[in-house]
Amino acid sequence: HTAAQDNCTCPTNKMTVCSPDGPGGRCQCRALGSGVAVDCSTLTSECLLLKARMSAPKNARTLVRPNEHALVDNDGLYDPDCDPEGRFKARQCNQTSVCWCVNSVGVRRTDKGDLSLRCDELVRTHHILIDLRHRPTAGAFNHSDLDAELRRLFRERYRLHPKFVAAVHYEQPTIQIELRQNTSQKAAGDVDIGDAAYYFERDVKGESLFQGRGGLDLRVRGEPLQVERTLIYYLDEIPPKFSMKR
């Protein structure tokens, strides 16, 4: 199904305009900002979501130490260029002709340059580390129950195949979710780890992208899990190229 047939909406992306003008009068939805037709049975690519967002009106530890090449999205929001499949174009430029190269999740991976800057290929982000801090609770969550709950969430809510959730680490109050997905592992139809991480981040911030679904209500054996801080690290298949340590 492309979209909810009964009332013609997109369950997986509320930043769309839908109408029954698809083949055979079927509901078809297009992303705001780009007008690209989206598949409402799966997550929409982060590039199209970011474009839609920019077009909308403004208003001895078990924890993983991020690799020295890990990127954090410090640049914030920008209006991206997406390819016809909705992926980020390798080179992004702003209105003042400042350009830079990005990875598959749209995070800058080079110094900024001018229009002569070349970005030969879109480098894949194959490892994402989601670092969360939960609000104080009476006691620590059971690690196994927390682990299973987060794996279930990524399967059920984001449709991410279980093989791509590499690990869940917990050292109260810090939770780390590791997502891994090499180019060779990703089959047609598989949700991209970058898209799953983006939907999760928006859910955690109370800015759910889903249409007509309640916000994220995370519970571990009935105990609410409330996230108070999120930091996401991105590791690319090829290390980033910056002229100096950031």
Epitope: A4, S144, R151, R155, E156, H161, P162, K163, V191, G214
Partner: antibody, heavy 117, light 106 residues
Framework: EVQLVQSGPEVKKPGASVKVSCKAS????????IGWVRQAPGQGLEWIGE????????YYTEKFKGRVTMTADTSTSTAYMELSSLRSEDTAVYYC??????????WGQGTLVTVSS | DIQLTQSPSSLSASVGDRVTITCSAS?????MYWYQQKPGKAPKLLIY???TLASGVPSRFSGSGSGTDFTLTISSLQPEDFATYYC?????????FGQGTKLEIK
């Protein structure tokens, strides 16, 4: 072809334990989840829990916690479910089922466990 | 736990009839799944994500609904459709099933 082949029927006495096996083929074992569901005679389906085969992460329902143990042997692509302190109410057909981005997409043929003195 | 209540519990119908089975959840769920089970056999996935037919399932089956109310419809009953049908949710642990609807020949 995806297949889940379960072990044969078992008859056990109250208080004993039973271990049901589920041998998988036709897919990469460690990429998936195996869930366990039971069905008492003439009754509906009841979920017991699941094991993530790649990480060994397990979730048991509250009702079975403490009495059930789920394991997996990746070398033989076999998942196991052991239920201890058996009582007559545990008489049921026990199913294993594969999970992916669906809760259960392929099912084993079922194993009848009879608990009788 | 999310309770799922199916209605009716049993149903007698004839070949060619249109049949509707409902599943009501005690709290909102994202999607509903439907399974068909024949005597002595394992359940078979029929519908996933509320309305998408599983591979090989005939188009006479359809699913709809949202929130707490979901429906399975068989537009024109065939002899092989007489079976027991279960709804199931996995929006939260533990996964739960409806009590089942037994569809019998009138």
């Amino acid at each position: 072809e995806v297949q889940l082949v379960q072990s044969g029927p078992e008859v056990k006495k109250p208080g004993a334990s039973v271990k049901v096996s589920c041998k998988a083929s036709g897919f990469t074992f460690t990429d998936y989840v195996i869930g366990w569901v039971r069905q008492a005679p003439g009754q509906g389906l009841e979920w017991i829990g699941e094991i993530y085969l790649g990480s060994g992460t397990i979730y048991y329902t509250e009702k079975f916690k403490g009495r059930v143990t789920m394991t997996a042997d990746t070398s033989t692509s076999t998942a196991y479910m052991e239920l201890s302190s058996l009582r007559s109410e545990d008489t049921a057909v026990y199913y294993c089922a594969r999970g992916s981005i669906f809760p259960f997409d392929y099912w084993g043929q079922g194993t009848l466990v009879t608990v009788s003195s | 736990d999310i309770q799922l209540t199916q209605s009716p519990s049993s149903l007698s119908a004839s070949v060619g009839d249109r049949v509707t089975i409902t599943c009501s959840a005690s709290s909102s769920v994202s999607y509903m799944y439907w399974y068909q089970q024949k005597p002595g056999k394992a359940p078979k996935l029929l519908i996933y994500d509320t309305s998408t037919l599983a591979s090989g399932v005939p188009s006479r089956f359809s699913g709809s609904g949202s929130g707490t109310d979901f429906t399975l419809t068989i537009s024109s009953l065939q002899p092989e459709d007489f079976a027991t049908y279960y709804c199931q949710q996995w929006s939260s642990y533990p996964y739960t099933f409806g009590q089942g609807t037994k569809l019998e020949i009138k």
